[in-house]
Amino acid sequence: TIPPHVQKSVNNDMIVTDNNGAVKFPQLCKFCDVRFSTCDNQKSCMSNCSITSICEKPQEVCVAVWRKNDENITLETVCHDPKLPYHDFILEDAASPKCIMKEKKKPGETFFMCSCSSDECNDNIIFSEEYNTSNPDLLLVIFQ
C-alpha cells in the first residue's frame, strides 16, 4: 500500500492499486509524438525515438501509430490509457508484451496501430503476419 505517511488524495488517477492496496509502477514508453519515418514494407521497424518517458498515469500503456499517405510516412509513439480510445480506436492489445501492428480503416491513408505493456515495447513495431495473435505461441506469451 501507499504507506501511512504518504497522503491519500481524492479521485486520484496517478495511483493505481490492486485489491490488496499494492501500488502499480508506471510504464516506460518511447514518447516522441509524431515523427517522419522511413519504415515501409518491413516485417518490423525500430522507432528511432530517443526519448523514453515515464508514463504520467500507471494505467497507461505504450502505443505506436504508423501512417502512410501520398506525401509521407509518420510514426507516432506515446503513452495512453487503454480505457480510452486513441484516434477513435480501442486499444485491444494493450496487455501484449509486444507491439504488433493491426491495420485500421482510415480514409485517404494506410493506418496501423499497436499497443503493449512492457517497458519500451513500442520501440520495436511488428508488422509481420507470423506475429499475428492467431498464433497460439504468442497467445501463450501474452497470457502467461
Epitope: 499494492a22 501500488v23 509502477f25
Partner: nanobody
Amino acid sequence: EVQLLESGGGLVQPGGSLRLSCAASGFTFTEYRMWWVRQAPGKGLEWVSAIEPIGNRTYYARSVDGRFTISRDNSKNTLYLQMNSLRAEDTAVYYCAKQMPGQKWMAKSRFDYWGQGTLVTVSS
C-alpha cells in the same frame, strides 16, 4: 532491515536548485531500479524519475525532463536528484522507492519500498 532515507529538501525560490539524496540500506542496492516519486499537497503521486541499477540508464516524466537529473552512487548505496529551474508546481514531498527488474506492483510494506520523504517548497 530495509531503509530508505531522503534528505536535501527545503525552501527555494523559483528558478533555484536543490539536490536530494536517498541513502539506502538493508538490501542489495545494485539489484534495484530506483525511483523518485513526489506528492504535492492534496494531489496524487507523480512518478518523477527512474534509474537502472547498472549502466545508469535514466528516465524522466515529461514535466521535469531537461530540468531534473537523477543519478546514483552504487559504492555509497545512494540515489540523487538534482533539481534545477525549480517552479512553484515542483512543491511536493519527494520520496525514493525501489523496484526489482520486471516488478509491476509495489508490495504492501511501509518501509520496504518507501522512504519517509523530504519536503521541497518552491516559493518567493
